[in-house]
């Protein structure tokens, strides 16, 4: 059964997923998708990393932690009720049937209060590591659509970032974790 995580409408949701790289910088590809983990890949992929970097993401989805140290926890910005559901974190360990997969259930609750406006910050400055994408799009149209419309001034609030980083520490022990090597 899926581990359940909760967030309120308008907040950033946090879905923990971790692995321990065999050696520093020896990264393993990871994908995140909407929907339970299928036999391969991550259903409708919303974000993925390769051996070096985040190489595909869609708007509102990012990695707030240090993915180079194995923190591949997913942050979903400014969630709505439509973001409820199961998400898949898949750690694509090379070899014969070595993948580790985790299903995480996100429950979105209506907001209790309307949050006051907060200062905005440039997405590129906050997350410079995410400025790489796969070199070409899909040969045919996939269910998810084509490459995301990447807006380099996507907004993230300082308050949400601070809360997410505290939450990351709180949930590290309860999140999906796998040691490699």
């Amino acid at each position: 059964s899926e581990v359940e995580y909760r967030a309120e409408v308008g907040q950033n949701a946090y879905l923990p997923c971790f692995y321990t790289p065999a050696a520093p910088g020896n990264l393993v590809p990871v994908c995140w998708g909407k929907g339970a983990c299928p036999v391969f890949e991550c259903g409708n992929v919303v974000l993925r990393t390769d051996e070096r970097d985040v190489n595909y993401w869609t708007s509102r989805y990012w990695l707030n932690g240090d993915f180079r140290k194995g923190d591949v926890s997913l942050t979903i910005e400014n969630v709505t009720l439509a973001d409820s559901g199961i998400y898949c974190c898949r750690i694509q360990i090379p070899g014969i049937m070595n993948d580790e997969k985790f299903n995480l259930k996100l429950v979105i609750k209506p907001a209790k209060v309307t949050p006051a406006p907060t200062r905005q910050r440039d997405f590129t400055a906050a997350f410079p590591r995410m400025l790489t994408t796969r070199g070409h799009g899909p040969a045919e149209t996939q269910t998810l659509g084509s490459l995301p419309d990447i807006n380099l001034t996507q907004i993230s609030t300082l308050a949400n970032e601070l809360r997410d980083s505290r939450l990351a520490n709180d949930l590290r022990d309860s999140g999906a974790t796998i040691r490699i090597g």
């Epitope: 929907g35 391969f40 890949e41 992929v45 694509q92 049937m97 899909p138 040969a139 045919e140 998810l144």
Partner: antibody, heavy 122, light 107 residues
Framework: EVKLVESGGGLVQPGGSLRLSCAAS????????MAWVRQAPGKGLEWVAN????????YYLDSLKSRFTISRDNAKNSLYLQMNSLKAEDTAVYYC???????????????WGQGTLVTVSS | DIQMTQSPSSLSASVGDRVTITCRAS??????LAWYQQKPGKAPQLLVY???TLAEGVPSRFSGSGSGTDFTLTISSLQPEDFATYYC?????????FGQGTKLEIK
Amino acid sequence: EVKLVESGGGLVQPGGSLRLSCAASGFTFSDYYMAWVRQAPGKGLEWVANINYDGSSTYYLDSLKSRFTISRDNAKNSLYLQMNSLKAEDTAVYYCARDVGYYGGNYGFAYWGQGTLVTVSS
Amino acid sequence: DIQMTQSPSSLSASVGDRVTITCRASDNIYSYLAWYQQKPGKAPQLLVYNAKTLAEGVPSRFSGSGSGTDFTLTISSLQPEDFATYYCQQHYGSPLTFGQGTKLEIK
């Protein structure tokens, strides 16, 4: 136009080996998982193996993984199946099929080759 | 392993009939189900993926539905070229597994 063309089938004695090939064209080969599926004469479909985009991860039917090896060469747009220690029950038409793509979403074998017949008999 | 059970195993129908084939999974496979059509001596052809999405080029008389463990393939008005064998297949658990097939014959 997407095309998958298998080759390498034929008659082989029990205990022998064969290497099947599948030449792919009409799509970005390295963007897709690829698979082998087989069908014994008059029987249903049976999945054999899958391989991820760059060949670093492979997946097999448990009963076959000690004898069969799936691999790919993205530079040549080719998929392979090395079959060792063949048995009479491995007799089947072997199909190469394109599986899920880099962005997920479409879970089904969208394109198939015409198949190549492997007959294991003495 | 996830077992896929199709029913019926064979079916006789006439051109113009509405036909439904069912597929039951032994475990929850969410919507990771595909349907294929196969004619004698030919490779299978994908009809439906993700339980209900029609593959490119497939006539709209075909439709898929269901999620979890119970799925159906419906042909709203049979055409002469639809007489073939139909297979369901799950993409949720390893190993990937197919149903045993449903042979659709002319009445």
